[in-house]
């Protein structure tokens, strides 16, 4: 078939409107001016173009902006965003939170695609840190976003942003990530009173050290078993039976059901059986009476 390059008479687009959906691909290429398209990008999303047609429009914008689109165009990409590659997006400089929201809205309901991940990365790097408004926006669209970041990336989250984090945002975080987030949360919530503080800090406790758990045990917090099971094993091991009892309050009875799972299993092995018996839960596996416990790690440190 002969390549059609000239725009047919009377078909030159004067504006971006619905009539263009009936243009064939070659007609769009020939009859739509790229500069006109760029200035009227806000109209594109309201017109039901096929993705085939959107490919043509994207090609026109790529030719007009080989170094990357300006933010005035990016903000109005709409469904055209779903035709962008991560390589395209790496050329962009997105600084406005409104632009970010507009593009995330297009992808709403879908998994985080490589394009979206690249967009977020460009945006956060441009801002220098993950501020509260950005974090609010990202976790609203992708609850698991925070846990997709490396510990190094999380280190750029300012403590003030922690207020935006909801418990479900931390569901998939691993201990290394919580190790980074916990001190920030502790700092963010430090001026709250006991019970309010515990409600806020609870979902971050997977990063808490032993001394903080000991302090919490003195505050009648009644930690639930689900939270206890997410604590760092190395932080739980030094706790005494009395401290765990105080920490869990009425939930201490739940230890029996978890006695074969970490960190409960490992903690039981470190306790005197006599002490475990005081709980009246039938926990077994503690150190028998009369046995001496040598802490070899202490011995090595001394020698």
């Amino acid at each position: 078939e002969v390549e059609k390059t000239a725009c047919p008479s009377g078909k030159k687009a004067r504006e971006i409107d619905e009539s263009l959906i009936f243009y064939k691909k070659w007609e769009l290429e020939a009859c739509v001016d790229a500069a006109l398209l760029a200035t009227q990008m806000d109209r594109v999303n309201a017109i039901p173009f096929t993705y085939e047609q959107l490919d043509v429009l994207k090609h026109k914008l790529d030719e007009l902006y080989p170094q990357g689109y300006p933010e005035s165009v990016i903000q109005h990409l709409g469904y055209l965003f779903l035709k962008m590659s991560p390589e395209d997006i790496r050329k962009w400089n997105v600084t406005s939170l409104e632009t970010l929201k507009a593009l995330l809205e297009v992808n709403k309901g879908h998994e985080m695609s490589p394009q979206v991940a690249t967009l977020i990365d460009r945006f956060v790097k441009g801002r220098g840190q993950l501020d509260k408004d950005t974090l609010d926006t990202l976790t609203a669209f992708y609850p698991g976003y925070l846990c997709s970041l490396s510990p190094e990336e999380l280190s750029s989250v300012p403590p003030s942003s922690i207020w935006a984090v909801r418990p479900q945002d931390l569901d998939t975080c691993d201990p290394r990530q919580l190790d980074v987030l916990y001190p920030k949360a502790r700092l963010a919530f430090q001026n709250m009173n006991g019970s309010e503080y515990f409600v806020k800090i609870q979902s971050f406790l997977g990063g808490a050290p032993t001394e903080d758990l000991k302090a919490l045990s003195q505050q009648n917090v009644s930690m639930d078993l689900a939270t206890f099971m997410k604590l760092r094993t190395d932080a739980v091991l030094p706790l005494t039976v009395a401290e765990v009892q105080k920490l869990l309050g009425p939930h201490v009875e739940g230890l029996k059901a978890e006695e074969r799972h970490r960190p409960v299993r490992d903690w039981i092995l470190r306790q005197r059986q006599d002490d475990l018996d005081t709980l009246g839960l039938g926990l077994q596996g503690g150190i028998p009476n009369g046995y001496l416990v040598l802490d070899l790690s202490m011995q090595e440190a001394l020698s």
Partner: nanobody
């Protein structure tokens, strides 16, 4: 997204046909859908579109004679064609916008087409 057209056939000039396009797969309601046709030896052309919001658009040549609609409960797109003309003999294809979940790209899904012959 899989699309299967039906309802084509042989009809006399001035007659009517109703084409159906059954969609299976993800998010039927979320995207624009439409009908294209391709006559023998001609380029494919868009006939009618219904947007995700329910707005309808028609090629000038079919306005007032063709009606596009969709039934969300049946995941089906329709094209009611009245006062058919011999020059509208073509294979009619339905399409739906979709989303490639593996690649993260928007794309068009097409049916295999249903043949309409107007004598």
């Amino acid at each position: 997204v899989q699309l299967v057209e039906s309802g084509g056939g042989l009809v006399q000039a001035g007659g009517s046909l109703r084409l159906s396009c059954a969609a299976s797969g993800r998010t039927f309601s979320s995207y624009n859908m439409g009908w294209h046709r391709q006559a023998p030896g001609k380029e494919r052309e868009l006939v009618a579109v219904i947007s995700s919001g329910g707005s309808t658009y028609y090629a000038d040549s079919v306005k007032g004679r063709f009606t596009i609609s969709r039934d969300y409960s049946k995941n089906t797109l329709y094209l009611q064609m009245n006062s058919l003309k011999p020059e509208e003999t073509a294979v009619y294809y339905c399409y739906a916008q979709g989303y490639d979940y593996d690649e993260g790209y928007g794309m068009d899904y097409w049916g295999q087409g249903t043949s309409v012959t107007v004598s």
